[in-house]
Interface confidence: low
């Protein structure tokens, strides 16, 4: 007689990342009997929800249910029916919703309420929707990458990113979204001078003093809005000659859209026109200078700061840069470990100077909205990392642009689920975890 395969003793979890520009659903899977081991949870599916971020549904909340349907139905297909009722679903909203809440708590509540009602109608164990704090976003991103890299336990079987002498150091986490950016790492024997930026964790029997900060309004999309609002102040007419866009590029912007976000409030002024036209001139150096004006470095009440008076300890160790840090650099073909900071800057100068018509031809398959912003985004990443966070040409070598680790996306969602399902023990489990290479 033929042997029947025993049913897999596995568990599933779902996290929706409701970001400022879009929502993604992640499905995670792990062996039920190994919940407390490190590295056993892995991503089996990512479903990108079609449409904008949930904060854009504020005037059309009745469409939220339909918006979420495709990815929730996909989750129904991927996860065996017998496990639907015990599969937790979490939705975390990030900086897009933080900004909406700043404008109107009632409107943010309305969106979240409809999201909760919609997700409650599925057969899963829905655990709630909430706006996570910037601190949580940074912390969970740090937990995710270090969990996937096996940094929290002694077992090291496959990692080749760094030398053996440094194997047990945790990685710092650099996360770039559309509306905020996070920096999180363990400083070397340094007091974290600002209590708001200090986190204490005990994970797998080891204590970690972690620095984290989330810069709201400094995600790539909001940073661009800030830059435009700043630059239009000094424009002599309704033409904005912009070095961060390719030569020959033209786009009309509504002033009302520019001032819609709380991020541009500090630059708001009464303009003698309702629209203006961006005309690209494609100059990296000028673009870089314009971006630097967004970082206030003149004031620092601590021993050292990033920008805007925010404490930042000396950088320490290796960093994983993910989310938009990775997507933008991947598009620009600059994620290789071998590319020096000087080389990246050279490549950006050349890329930004390319005429818009040429760019459109070279990247015919890419949506023009995204394509037009890579010069700005790439320049912004360099400015943020070098002048904002004080990476140098030397420490640049310690930045690893990471999309996935062992098939799981780098980002805050896995860390969030691990925390909420109590799958990261404070003490080292008694059983020895299997090395990653054991898992297919």
């Amino acid at each position: 007689t033929q042997n029947k395969a025993l049913p897999e003793n596995v568990k599933y979890g779902i996290v929706l990342d409701a970001g400022s520009s879009h929502t993604s659903l992640y499905i995670y899977k792990w062996p039920a009997e190994k919940e407390n081991d490190t590295g056993v949870v892995h991503q089996v599916e990512e479903c990108r929800v079609k449409g904008p971020g949930i904060s854009k549904f504020v005037q059309k909340v009745n469409e939220i249910g339909i918006y979420l349907t495709d990815c929730m139905e996909r989750a129904r297909e991927v996860i065996p029916r017998s496990q639907h009722q015990e599969t937790p679903v979490y939705l975390g909203a990030t900086a897009g919703m933080r900004l909406l809440r700043m404008e109107s708590e009632e409107l943010a509540d309305r969106v979240l309420d409809v999201v909760e009602r919609s997700l409650s109608n599925y057969p899963f164990d829905f655990q709630g929707a909430r706006i996570i704090t910037g601190q949580e976003e940074g912390a969970y991103g740090w937990i995710t990458i270090n969990y996937l890299l096996g940094r929290f336990t002694q077992e090291q079987s496959w990692l080749s990113l760094i030398s053996d002498s440094q194997k047990q150091e945790t990685f710092g986490a650099l996360d770039l979204g559309g509306a905020s950016t996070q920096v999180t790492f363990v400083p070397q024997n340094q007091t974290i001078e600002s209590p708001d930026n200090a986190l204490q964790f005990r994970l797998y029997g080891k204590d970690y003093n972690v620095y984290t900060h989330s810069f709201l309004c400094y995600g790539k999309d909001q940073a661009l809005w800030q830059k435009l609002a700043k630059d239009i102040q000094v424009a002599s007419n309704e033409i904005l000659r912009d070095p961060c866009f390719h030569p020959g590029y033209k786009k009309v912007v509504n002033v009302s859209d520019l001032y819609k976000t709380p991020c541009t409030k500090r630059f708001e002024m009464t303009l003698p026109f309702q629209q203006f036209e961006i005309q690209g001139i494609g100059n990296y150096q000028q673009c870089h200078q314009s971006i630097l004006e967004l970082f206030n470095t003149s004031y620092c009440p601590y021993s050292q700061c990033a920008f805007n008076g925010i404490f930042l300890p000396p950088l320490q160790g290796d960093f994983g840069a993910f989310s938009a840090f990775y997507f933008v650099m991947k598009f620009l073909n600059l994620t290789s470990e071998k590319v020096s900071q000087e080389k990246v800057t050279e490549m950006m100068k050349k890329f930004c100077a390319q005429p818009w018509e040429e760019i459109k031809t070279s990247y015919a398959g890419v949506k023009e909205k995204y394509l037009s912003e890579y010069c700005f985004s790439g320049t912004y990443i360099l400015s943020l990392l070098l002048q904002g966070y004080h990476f140098t040409a030397d420490s640049w070598e310690h930045i690893h642009f990471i999309g996935k680790i062992q098939g799981s996306d780098a980002g805050w969602t896995l860390g969030y689920m691990l925390n909420l399902t109590n799958m990261i023990p404070a003490e080292q489990p008694l059983s020895t975890p299997l090395s990653h290479s054991t898992y297919v």
Epitope: V61, N62, I64, G65, E106, A108, D109, R110, L112, D113, V114, E116, R117, S118, S120, F126, Q127, G128, R130, I131, I132, T133
Partner: antibody, heavy 120, light 113 residues
Framework: QVQLVQSGAEVKKPGSSVKVSCKAS????????ISWVRQAPGQGLEWMGG??????NYAQKFQGRVTITADESTSTAYMELSSLRSEDTAVYYC???????????????WGQGTTVTVSS | GIVMTQSPDSLAVSLGERATINCKSS????????????LAWYQQKPGQPPKLLIY???TRASGVPDRFSGSGSGTDFTLTISSLQAEDVAVYYC?????????FGGGTKVEIK
């Protein structure tokens, strides 16, 4: 001051449907989450479902049998329960609130209740 | 869903004495974003709809006498009537509005001894 006024008592046969209305006055109806709660004779309170901002949500027990709708033009919410059986005999209440975000203050305004008797 | 367990089922207290009702939720109803507990207490008198007494576990609804107070956090909550009056004879319910489906406790009947 928001007030909720419900339709009158109903006597129904098993297998039939009942539709109870709940009219709001004195408030912006479009931003009111409305919950429906029932109470069988001598029993406790049981949440059936609710509607808010155009989206309905139902307790698993009633899924497929209950339909909650709202008509903003008349500021009225409706709860329809089908395939009635004798154990559906209860007082049915509508209440404002009951959504985690929009109903942050619990169910603060209640209708007077509608008695539905299911009997052959 | 979250199961709400109330105790005791009934309670007889002398006029002017303290009445204490407990409510336990099967999982935490504390929302970390705003540090609020999504728990309400209701009073229901015979032939009347329920009346909201307390929301967010400890905030009195408008018009509720200050002899009614709510306390607790996470999974364990208490409704206290500091000095029972004749008009307080009723059934009291706790309810979570943290997650759908919204759920009520089984109720506690308060009578005069």
């Amino acid at each position: 001051q928001v007030q909720l006024v419900q339709s009158g008592a109903e006597v129904k046969k098993p297998g039939s449907s009942v539709k109870v209305s709940c009219k709001a006055s004195g408030g912006t109806f479009s931003s009111l989450p409305i919950s429906w709660v029932r109470q069988a004779p001598g029993q406790g309170l049981e949440w059936m479902g609710g509607i808010g901002f155009g989206t309905a949500n139902y307790a698993q027990k009633f899924q497929g049998r209950v339909t909650i709708t709202a008509d903003e033009s008349t500021s009225t919410a409706y709860m329809e329960l089908s395939s009635l059986r004798s154990e559906d005999t209860a007082v049915y209440y509508c209440a404002r609130g009951g959504a985690k975000y929009a109903g942050r203050y619990g169910m603060d305004v209640w209708g007077q209740g509608t008695t539905v008797t299911v009997s052959s | 869903g979250i199961v709400m367990t109330q105790s005791p089922d009934s309670l007889a207290v002398s006029l002017g004495e303290r009445a204490t009702i407990n409510c336990k939720s099967s999982q935490s109803v504390l929302f970390s974003s705003n540090n609020k507990n999504y728990l309400a207490w209701y009073q229901q008198k015979p032939g009347q709809p329920p009346k909201l007494l307390i929301y967010w576990a400890s905030t009195r609804a408008s018009g509720v006498p200050d002899r009614f107070s709510g306390s607790g956090s996470g999974t364990d909550f208490t409704l206290t009537i500091s000095s029972l009056q004749a008009e307080d004879v009723a059934v009291y319910y706790c309810q979570q509005y943290y997650l759908y489906p919204l759920t009520f406790g089984g109720g506690t009947k308060v009578e005069i001894k």
